[in-house]
Interface confidence: medium
């Protein structure tokens, strides 16, 4: 069991400068730790690649909305 106090913090130091079509994204998580230099969103793609993105960008906000809706309406 990892020690919560000393758990490593994942930070983003650079953001992708290219959009990723929403259908290539599987999930996301927000990075808001004060230990990180900037707030970020980490997208996980359908091939399990992790990509840092800028939460201020419209495509990032659109993508998070899309993924949130996918969770709310599971496929039959």
């Amino acid at each position: 069991q990892p020690d919560a106090i000393n758990a490593p913090v994942t930070c983003c130091y650079n953001f992708t400068n290219r959009k990723i079509s929403v259908q290539r994204l599987a999930s996301y998580r927000r990075i808001t730790s004060s230990k990180c230099p900037k707030e970020a969103v980490i997208f996980k793609t359908i091939v399990a690649k992790e990509i840092c993105a800028d939460p201020k960008q419209k495509w990032v906000q659109d993508s998070m909305d899309h993924l949130d809706k996918q969770i709310q309406t599971p496929k039959p």
Epitope: K19, I20, S21, V22, Q23, R24, K58, W59, D62, H66
Partner: antibody, heavy 122, light 107 residues
Framework: QVQLVESGGGLVQPGGSLRLSCAAS????????MSWVRQAPGKGLEWVSS??????????SYAASVKGRFTISRDNSKNTLYLQMNSLRAEDTAVYYC?????????????WGQGTLVTVSS | DIELTQPPSVSVAPGQTARISCSGD??????VYWYQQKPGQAPVLVIY???NRPSGIPERFSGSNSGNTATLTISGTQAEDEADYYC??????????FGGGTKLTVL
């Protein structure tokens, strides 16, 4: 360099059918979405239909004005986009452009063909 | 679909700044794209993602988008900029919505 060349336009009677083609070259065709956009004489641009890229299993979408009458398709082995137009009406008269896009849903068109004219008249 | 409204025409003297507006509900929350179309030619993308220029497009073309209005600005307008200009945005499922177009006349 990217090239899109439309063909198949012409004069057709109301109720008739026509199939447009768009031959693509200079890019990896299957990785891009493709659309048809039309422009009636002296009027503005109107999006007609899109077929997405390999990442979305080539999903299709249509404008309400053509849904049920037009069918978009693609042959990735031939780098060609198609638009099958049935039950044509006078208001379908327009120059039809094919155009490519990369990302969904942020669809914008970075390259366009020169267009092919479809005239629906008796 | 998002409805985009443009003025039918805008006139500008050579060397002056032309501004073409495009309005729509909460447009600032979406990306806006601009195309130039000269008579008998296919449209050409001049601005993407609100304010980015594709390679080969002169620096005098710029874009902005906030609130309900996006604006295409052409600084130091030249005679060759005379054309129709269309704004475009998107909805879900790869559908695209175009404005009605603005005819730019360079006096």
């Amino acid at each position: 360099q990217v090239q899109l060349v439309e063909s198949g336009g012409g004069l057709v009677q109301p109720g008739g059918s026509l199939r447009l083609s768009c031959a693509a070259s200079g890019f990896t065709f299957r990785s891009y979405g493709m659309s048809w956009v039309r422009q009636a004489p002296g009027k503005g641009l109107e999006w007609v239909s899109s077929i997405e890229h390999k990442w979305t299993n080539y999903a299709t979408s249509y404008a309400a004005s053509v849904k049920g009458r037009f069918t978009i398709s693609r042959d990735n082995s031939k780098n060609t986009l198609y638009l099958q137009m049935n039950s044509l009406r006078a208001e379908d008269t327009a120059v039809y452009y094919c155009a490519r896009f990369e990302f969904t849903p942020w669809t914008y068109f970075d390259f366009w063909g020169q267009g092919t004219l479809v005239t629906v008249s008796s | 679909d998002i409805e985009l409204t443009q003025p039918p025409s805008v006139s500008v003297a050579p060397g002056q700044t032309a501004r073409i507006s495009c309005s729509g509900d909460n447009l600032g929350k979406k990306y806006v794209y601009w195309y130039q179309q000269k008579p008998g030619q296919a449209p050409v993308l001049v601005i993407y993602d609100d304010d980015n220029r594709p390679s080969g497009i002169p620096e005098r073309f710029s874009g902005s988008n906030s609130g309900n209005t996006a604006t295409l600005t052409i600084s130091g307008t030249q005679a060759e900029d005379e054309a129709d200009y269309y704004c475009q945005s998107y909805t879900a499922q790869s559908s695209a919505s175009f404005g009605g177009g603005t005819k730019l006349t360079v006096l």
